[in-house]
Amino acid sequence: LVLGSCRALEVANGTVTSLPGATVTLICPGKEAAGNVTIHWVYSGSQNREWTTTGNTLVLRDVQLSDTGDYLCSLNDHLVGTVPLLVDVPPEEPKLSCFRKNPLVNAICEWRPSSTPSPTTKAVLFAKKINTTNGKSDFQVPCQYSQQLKSFSCQVEILEGDKVYHIVSLCVANSVGSKSSHNEAFHSLKMVQPDPPANLVVSAIPGRPRWLKVSWQHPETWDPSYYLLQFQLRYRPVWSKEFTVLLLPVAQYQCVIHDALRGVKHVVQVRGKEELDLGQWSEWSPEVTGTPWIAEPRTTPAGILWNPTQVSVEDSANHEDQYESSTEATSVLAPVQE
């Protein structure tokens, strides 16, 4: 399916374009430069380069990107004409990825080139909207390049509750070439993928040598006043590769792990998904580590280790505790297929 025609950009009339390494011939545009006259050439760029030619042609060998600029030809110290030269590298083939961070926002399609594109490089997103009611409609979206993020990004408008498929392709072009990405298809609702939960904190609970308290927040890009998130939590001892996964109730932003290994550092991560299973799970949050509470043994004057008061709570008969009701989680033993 071809979404649009991806062509090299047109250049201003009279502009000479070239690939790096080529030999370029510039022709002074004034009629008066024809014949056996002595023409003086000056490059208008940063380096002060000058040439004198008999006749109206200037030959530049092995041109490079830095040779881009205006070449001024003059006769008797008067400007006769300007020849713009644009040396550019054809764009690389873009690899497009599209996402939608919550059900209220537009989809964003982006591409991060492996090397900084030339200033003349432009990108446009060709899109086809496939709607069960209205059929198909084609449109184009201009894309912006961010110097900070080093990526092109384009917004595809999606209204809240829209149930439509989009097929998109990114066209990247400059004066010497153009490339299109492979077509990317997505469904407006199924593509919703939250950012990972934020500010994950893992802490020990005094008196509980096998418990870890975990808390987190919704990502900045998710507004919980409209759509709630459900979460999965996974944890493992640092030396293990296998995770235990807990599926948590909707809108629960903390949890207590009851079966951590005593005295062992654990890796914990959380991910989120829209409460009604709309879209996809977020990526797992960055790993955070925590170690359960460790009893501090006391030394008697005789040097005997003795700690009669610090019997761990789970070894005592009393299991009623403020943390006891904090999880009603479904436990799934890993390895987890993602």
Epitope: E32, D77, H78
Partner: antibody, heavy 116, light 107 residues
Framework: QSLEESGGDLVKPGASLTLACTAS?????????MCWVRQAPGKGLEWIGC???????TYYASWAKGRFTISETSSTAATLQMTSLTAADTATYFC??????????WGPGTLVTVSS | DIVMTQTPSSVSAAVGDTVTINCQAS??????LTWYQQKPGQRPKLLIY???TLASGVPSRFKGSGSGTDFTLTISDLECADAATYYC?????????FGGGTEVVVK
Amino acid sequence: QSLEESGGDLVKPGASLTLACTASGFSFSSGYYMCWVRQAPGKGLEWIGCIYTGSDTTYYASWAKGRFTISETSSTAATLQMTSLTAADTATYFCARDLGSRGNLWGPGTLVTVSS
Amino acid sequence: DIVMTQTPSSVSAAVGDTVTINCQASENIYSFLTWYQQKPGQRPKLLIYRASTLASGVPSRFKGSGSGTDFTLTISDLECADAATYYCQRNAYSSWAFGGGTEVVVK
């Protein structure tokens, strides 16, 4: 080497007039820019146009196109033809050969007065 | 057409002073700028071409600078003989353009 303008006169509005620029000590055939510039009494310099001698290449200020015509009449003479003259065209008309580093030559000017 | 804007339109200075005249082009003219001096009843005299190159026989008290759109003519050690009107000119045969002129009065 020198240039001299001639043909300046007192004419009535709507009239036409041709000014001549004659070169001494050099000929136009070697490819020069011959330009015409005018200066109204007490005002600044105003470019009219240029001809590249030995070719049919002419350039004009946008306001001069259509009413002013520059021609090369011989290897030592160029002319400026002016039509539909108005009082605003009253000025001293200079012809100039400007070669930058190779020398700059202006005639003394010729006065054109348009008055009824 | 390119427009050349000269400032100030008139300047008065004493003998020995330094005078600066500015010329601004409405678009990039690189270094293709000429400065002329004209005294009443006389033809213009070339002072500086290519923005900064002194014409033959012109004293070094005259100095041109600038490129692109902004140019300056500086006359140092002002003399009585410098009393005149000074013009900047864009030097492209396809379109000359003169500034409005700056009258220099020597007190």
